[in-house]
């Protein structure tokens, strides 16, 4: 990644300014290192794109808690 | 296939108006944001507009803000560029393109349609 | 608006060289940098997303880095089917805007 040079850790310095279809999302991250500037959270689409958002946002929230629950089901 | 597919150019004389149209398939379009992009004949490429996914949100460039209005119906799956008081300076093949959002950004272009050239001339 | 100078406009080279390509930013766009292909009467093509991050499908002779005001594409080994016109495209901040373009010739 281009923020994760020479450091295990990719920051986010700026978040997205769109909601994300949940449709499009297969899974996410947190990132809380203190080598970032700022808490985020980090989606992957399902075309493996990451975008960074912002953790105090109640869609990012709401996705978040969609991811887990895909996750906790188990598929038939 | 994943496709977007263009219509409604042509030749328009100044101060007309001209309806473009963009038919996606292949892809879930109310998933995407979708954008305008133009290229005026041996130049390079300029943004216009792009709207949201249930069409509520809408950005343009300052020089077609007020003549130029961006609107999409997702059970058609298709995006439309509505063109008034065109000018000379507007002649240029004119593109759809889904519209994704980057790790540090939104609004880079992923899948483009082939283009329709619209001529503004008297 | 932020302003994107590319730089060469032009350039002439040959097939199995190293061509690098730069885009200058007037402001700062962090990573939010896209680049293009574009030949006669097509579509531009996404080549590169975030600055360096590779388009699926792209051949790997392609590369992406920067960040700041100072980016580059390098294709580092030039093939017959790349001669074409790149852009870079930053989607920091609205407008979205594009480079002028630098056209890639067989010399």
């Known amino acids: 990644q281009p923020d994760a040079i020479n450091a295990p850790v990719t920051c986010c310095y700026n978040f997205t300014n769109r909601k994300i279809s949940v449709q499009r999302l297969a899974s996410y991250r947190r990132i809380t290192s203190s080598k970032c500037p700022k808490e985020a959270v980090i989606f992957k689409t399902i075309v493996a794109k990451e975008i960074c958002a912002d953790p105090k946002q109640k869609w990012v929230q709401d996705s978040m808690d969609h991811l887990d629950k895909q996750t906790q089901t188990p598929k038939t | 296939e994943v496709q977007l597919v263009q219509s409604g150019g042509g030749l328009v004389q100044p101060g007309g108006s001209l309806r473009l149209s963009c038919a996606a398939s292949g892809f879930t379009f109310s998933h995407y944001w979708m954008s305008w992009v133009r290229q005026a004949p041996g130049k390079g490429l300029e943004w216009l507009a792009n709207?949201?996914?249930?069409?509520?949100?809408?950005y343009y460039v300052d020089s077609v803000k007020g003549r130029f209005t961006i609107s999409r119906d997702n059970a058609k799956n298709s995006l439309y560029l509505q063109m008034n008081s065109l000018r000379a300076e507007d002649t240029a093949v004119y593109f759809c393109?889904?519209?994704?959002?980057?790790?540090?950004?939104?609004?880079?272009?992923?899948?483009w349609g082939r283009g329709t050239l619209v001529t503004v001339s008297s | 608006a932020i302003q994107l100078t590319q730089s060469p406009s032009s350039l002439s080279a040959s097939v199995g060289d190293r061509v690098i390509l730069t885009c200058r930013a007037s402001?700062?766009?962090?990573?939010?940098l896209a680049w293009y292909q574009q030949k006669p009467g097509k579509a531009p093509k996404l080549l590169i997303y975030d600055a360096s991050s590779l388009e699926s499908g792209v051949p790997s002779r392609f590369s992406g880095s920067g960040s700041g005001p100072d980016f580059t594409l390098t294709i580092s080994s030039l093939q017959p089917e790349d001669f074409a016109t790149y852009f870079c495209q930053q989607f920091n901040s609205y407008p979205l805007t594009f480079g002028g373009g630098t056209k890639v010739e067989i010399k």
């Open positions: 393109a889904r519209d994704l959002e980057g790790l540090h950004g939104d609004g880079y272009f992923d899948l």
């Open positions: 402001q700062g766009v962090s990573s939010a």
């Open positions: 709207i949201e996914q249930d069409g509520s949100e809408k």
